[in-house]
Interface confidence: low
Amino acid sequence: QPDAINAPVTCCYNFTNRKISVQRLASYRRITSSKCPKEAVIFKTIVAKEICADPKQKWVQDSMDHLDKQTQTPKT
């Protein structure tokens, strides 16, 4: 049988049209694979749901910045 190739890639085909409160976001990852039709950001919420978002939208950029700062701040 033919082999699978490399690792799985997740794609986003549409984006949420609702701004998600930053308090509800736990993490994010960027989707930049050439095998996907759109660059995207996938937010993981505090209840572990993943949602596709448009990286060009300001609220998405702000949310990523906020999460980056949270990660950089040591938890005591």
């Epitope: 085909y13 995207a40 949602i51």
Partner: antibody, heavy 127, light 110 residues
Amino acid sequence: SLEESGGDLVKPGASLTLTCKASGIDFSLYSYMCWVRQAPGKGLEWIACVDAGASGSTYYASWAKGRFTISKTSSTTVTLQMTSLTAADTATYFCARGILYYTWPYPAGAIDAFDSWGPGTLVTVSS
Amino acid sequence: AYDMTQTPASVSEPVGGTVTIKCQASESISNYLSWYQQKPGQPPKLLIYKASTLASGVPSRFKGSGSGTEYTVTISGVQSDDAATYYCQQSYSSSNVFNTFGGGTEVVVK
């Protein structure tokens, strides 16, 4: 519909190009043109796909890299070039449309299935 | 490699009976699984995708289920027209649009 052509009886070591012509099939951003083969009395084996959209990106099964080349030659035509053929390449070669399914707005794994197939073209490699 | 193992290789069932075909992946494929039916001299026909969604025009006697590494297609009230070879296909590789097929299961209807 999809229709393959170019199947033939060839000698080991020869090269051959197969063509798939599509008619009346919608090729959106989320579809691929693919080749799958089936040796006589055996199972299905995926060979390669090409993005039917503008990118024309190509993808191969690891065993097919190097000896097989898939190309989108027009918006409705795809070819499969095969080199250094051996008896093990004797098979019916099917052209198929790979379609992606997804749920908005959640991330999708670009789930695919082959939802449309041609009748196949027979390639026989024998001396 | 996400290898797919299909069982049984062959099954015989009388008209009206129930046929169950299993497909096991070497690692989790997260429901990225399709099923095909192929009759002699014909190309395969898509039956089920996303593990459990019936393709257009497929009779409701076909049912797909499963998760993780184990998946099943069940044909309830099997008919003579269901005699064919059935293949599973995973699409959890690379960009998740490329796959491996199972080895196939021949269904004989008595």
